[in-house]
């Protein structure tokens, strides 16, 4: 079954292709399901679900998230604004989907189809986005000793920021499905 | 477990903050909802609040009713009570096992508001 | 906003029934189905349209897609009086209430 795609929707050739909006939905939501995966493995193979300690790791990342300012909340809410934020947000976290490629044993694939997919969520939105000059692309240097700083931690660090790479890209796709669904 | 407190007689106009507590878990990880029922009569939902600090609030609630959150309790302030505002009010967790539905899967027993002059 | 249907319904001991719930644009499957007795918070029973929540008996049976979902029970026992309710979780925007009317089960 192809990303985002239900098998019931598949069996029926009769029904209307989807809209930008209904894709978009759907693969946000199939990237979901991945996330929920990765950190089912996660928080069985350590407690760092249960943990208390994540802010030690939280001072070394710099994940995006979502605030009122953005205008994606239903207070103030700025299409405009919030989707030059929700492109600006998934491109920044591309590295850490790029850490997360050798970080799972069983779950390697579905690991490799949440970095796939989300390159094709960030195509599918940017097509969407009237302000393409608003959306700062990350550097790639930062980016790269970024990737090998976050190599070099012990491996407590590393489970640790597994769990909070996963977590936080959970909610800012939550938040984003949110928003997209009042545009 | 959820607990909700603060719930009483009031008198119309009278602003109202009722408090859910949680025990055994931390509020700051799942989302958060209250919801009402008038005696009798079915679930009307009043609001979340996400994980992401976000508000989102029924159309007839907006503007009178504020909920907000710390890792232990969420509160829900309300102003400018009527009796058509008498009902029982729970608050109730969402789920997180699955990444995006927002199903309530624990509830608390509920607290009771009166509004009457 | 979510219609459900019938408001009240009566059962014979062992019979099935089956409330339906509507919404006014597709949800995507994302609607839970809550059981609430007089006096009780609800309680959640099935989720995502059809998966049972933890410890809910089998005889509980959720289906649809788009904007049509349905809730069925069958082999209904005494316990199964209770009124019951359907919830979209697709959207929190621009919405009256996430809950349908709710649905009387009385069982003879």
């Known amino acids: 079954v192809p990303p985002g795609e239900d098998s019931k929707d598949v069996a029926a050739p009769h029904r209307q292709p989807l809209t930008s909006s209904e894709r978009i939905d759907k693969q946000i939501r199939y990237i979901l399901d991945g996330i929920s995966a990765l950190r089912k493995e996660t928080c069985n193979k350590s407690n760092m679900c249960e943990s208390s300690k994540e802010a030690l790791a939280e001072n070394n990342l710099n994940l995006p998230k979502m605030a009122e300012k953005d205008g994606c909340f239903q207070s103030g809410f700025n299409e405009e604004t919030c989707l030059v934020k929700i492109i600006t947000g998934l491109l920044e976290f591309e590295v850490y989907l790029e850490y997360l490629q050798n970080r799972f044993e069983s779950s390697e694939e579905q690991a490799r189809a949440v970095q796939m997919s989300t390159k094709v969520l960030i195509q599918f939105l940017q097509k969407k986005a009237k302000n393409l000059d608003a959306i700062t692309t990350p550097d790639p240097t930062t980016n790269a000793s970024l990737l090998t700083k976050l190599q070099a931690q012990n491996q407590w660090l590393q489970d640790m920021t597994t769990h909070l790479i996963l977590r936080s890209f959970k909610e800012f796709l939550q938040s984003s499905l949110r928003a997209l669904r009042q545009m | 477990s959820l607990e909700e407190s603060g719930g009483r007689l009031v008198t119309p106009g009278t602003p109202l903050t009722l408090t859910c507590t949680a025990s055994?878990?931390?509020?700051?990880?799942?989302?958060m909802s209250w919801v009402r029922q008038a005696p009798g009569k079915g679930l009307e939902w009043i609001g979340y609040?996400?994980?992401?600090?976000s508000t989102y609030y029924a159309n007839w609630a907006k503007g009178r009713f504020s909920i907000s959150k710390t890792s232990t309790t969420v509160d829900l302030k309300m102003t400018s009570l009527t009796a058509e505002d008498t009902a029982t009010y729970f608050c109730?967790?969402?789920?997180?096992?699955?990444?995006?539905?927002?199903?309530?899967?624990?509830w608390g027993p509920g607290t009771l508001v009166t509004v009457s002059s | 906003d979510m219609t459900q249907t019938p408001a009240s319904v009566e059962v014979a001991m062992g019979g099935t029934v089956t409330i339906k719930c509507q919404a006014s644009?597709?949800?995507?499957?994302?609607l839970s189905w809550y059981q609430q007795k007089p006096g009780q918070p609800p309680k959640l029973l099935i989720y995502?349209?059809?998966t049972l929540a933890s410890g809910v008996s089998s005889r509980f049976k959720g289906s649809g897609s788009g904007t049509e979902y349905t809730l069925t029970i069958s082999g209904v026992e005494c316990a199964d009086a209770a009124t019951y309710y359907c919830?979209?979780?697709?959207?929190?925007?621009?919405?009256?209430?996430?809950f349908g009317g709710g649905t009387e089960v009385v069982v003879k």
């Open positions: 644009q597709s949800i995507s499957n994302e």
């Open positions: 109730a967790k969402g789920s997180t096992d699955y990444a995006f539905d927002t199903r309530l899967d624990l």
């Open positions: 919830q979209q979780g697709y959207n929190s925007n621009d919405v009256d209430n996430v």
């Open positions: 055994g878990f931390s509020l700051s990880s799942y989302d």
């Open positions: 609040i996400y994980t992401d600090t």
């Open positions: 995502r349209t059809s």
